[in-house]
């Protein structure tokens, strides 16, 4: 399987809400001993590998923001903790999973990563991630609503498999 990021750049005005999205592509093993761990975190475009470093999103770590379930089941994070920080991550039955950030500030600008770990118990973990940039703008040059930019055609799915 792979992870696609439909949009590689989100440009939003301060105070707006935004939903960053990743999509699980390809066959998903729904076997008894296969489970999926999905999460979100901030990172940087590191010299070694993008999305390697895991930084908190609004003081919530990737451990706090994870989704746990098997296959394409729907899931969402612990509501109380995340919602107190204006965050909610969720997953549907079609392989889409997202994080919603409310009331954006300039401090929210940066690189965001989604991580999917396919856990094959007794064998190994297979991890894939997607990266996207969020730019929060203020002032007269800021858009009135979020503007999203699709991933470029040559890597239209902005896929990284590890």
């Amino acid at each position: 399987f792979k992870v696609a990021t439909p949009y590689s750049l989100y440009v939003c005005p301060e105070g707006q809400n935004v939903t960053l999205t990743c999509r699980l592509l390809g066959p998903v093993d729904k076997g008894h001993d296969v489970t999926f761990y999905k999460t979100w975190y901030r990172s940087s475009r590191g010299e070694v590998q993008t999305c390697s470093e895991r930084r908190p999103i609004r003081n919530l770590t990737f451990q706090d923001l994870h989704l746990h379930h098997g296959g394409h089941q729907a899931a969402n994070t612990s509501h109380d903790l995340a919602q107190r920080h204006g965050l909610e991550s969720a997953s549907d039955h079609h392989g889409n999973f997202s994080i919603t950030m409310r009331n954006l500030t300039l401090l929210d600008s940066g690189l965001y990563c989604c991580l999917v770990v396919e856990i094959r118990h007794h064998h190994s973990e297979h991890r894939v991630h997607g990266a996207m940039e969020l730019q929060v703008q203020t002032g007269k040059d800021a858009p009135s609503n979020c503007v999203v930019y699709p991933s470029s055609s040559q890597d239209s799915e902005n896929i990284t498999a590890a």
């Epitope: 451990q63 098997g70 064998h123 973990e125």
Partner: antibody, heavy 117, light 107 residues
């Protein structure tokens, strides 16, 4: 802040079964891998196995025939049973939280188990 | 299973000196390697994950590098509290294994 606490007898007779429990406080046990790791006196660390929140288990092949790990989510506890113990099983036993694609980020303080008659 | 070999077994240094610890894997573990610190009578503490990323709260004097089969943990300037045993651990597959450890002792 998640904390782990091991409990169980500190002395077990050879050929008997070692039983330990780890209590998880300050967070949910309904996610992650919950692992057992041991360390014989003066030696290195050995991963024993884990139970995943879903109930899936995975054991070190070197111990698989003797190990059972179970979970009681209602009590926020997971347990280790190691059968047919010998003196070679004398060690400090740690429970730990293991995050998928990450590491053992939270450990119990460890409990010493001596196998002796 | 993957065997992790740490060297040296013991490193005798003075506070303020640079410590370089090695971990070699019997086969490639990509960059899926962690480092832990253990002090006498205590549980191990996570220092580095994915070969080169510091865990939360770990001082900048600790750094990790390497990929594939050869990895290094560097402590740029030893503080008194850094004298301990250090273990590497891979997570490319199961069983998870640890290296035998490197003891960093005061010279």
């Amino acid at each position: 802040q998640v904390q782990l606490q091991e409990s169980g007898p500190g002395l077990v007779k050879p050929s008997e079964t070692l039983s330990l429990t780890c209590t998880v406080s300050g967070g949910s046990i309904s996610s992650y891998y919950w692992s057992w790791i041991r360390q014989p006196p003066g030696k290195g660390l050995e991963w024993i196995g884990y139970i995943y929140y879903s109930g899936s288990t995975n054991y070190n092949p070197s111990l698989k025939s003797r190990v059972t790990i179970s979970v009681d989510t209602s009590k926020s506890q997971f347990s280790l049973k190691l059968s047919s113990v010998t003196a070679a099983d004398t060690a400090v036993y740690y429970c730990a939280r293991d995050i998928p694609a990450f590491a053992f980020d939270i450990w119990g303080q460890g409990t010493m188990v001596i196998v002796s008659s | 299973e993957i065997v992790l070999t740490q060297s040296p077994a013991t490193l005798s240094l003075s506070p303020g000196e640079r410590a370089t610890l090695s971990c070699r894997a019997s086969q490639s573990v990509s960059y899926y390697l962690a480092w832990y610190q253990q002090k006498p009578g205590q549980a191990p503490r996570l220092l580095i994950y994915d070969a080169f990323n510091r865990a939360t709260g770990i001082p900048a004097r600790f750094s990790g590098s390497g990929s594939g089969t050869d990895f290094t943990l560097t402590i740029s300037s030893l503080e008194p509290e850094d004298f301990a045993v250090y273990y590497c651990q891979h997570r490319i597959n199961w069983p998870l294994t640890f290296g035998g450890g490197t003891k960093v002792e005061i010279k």
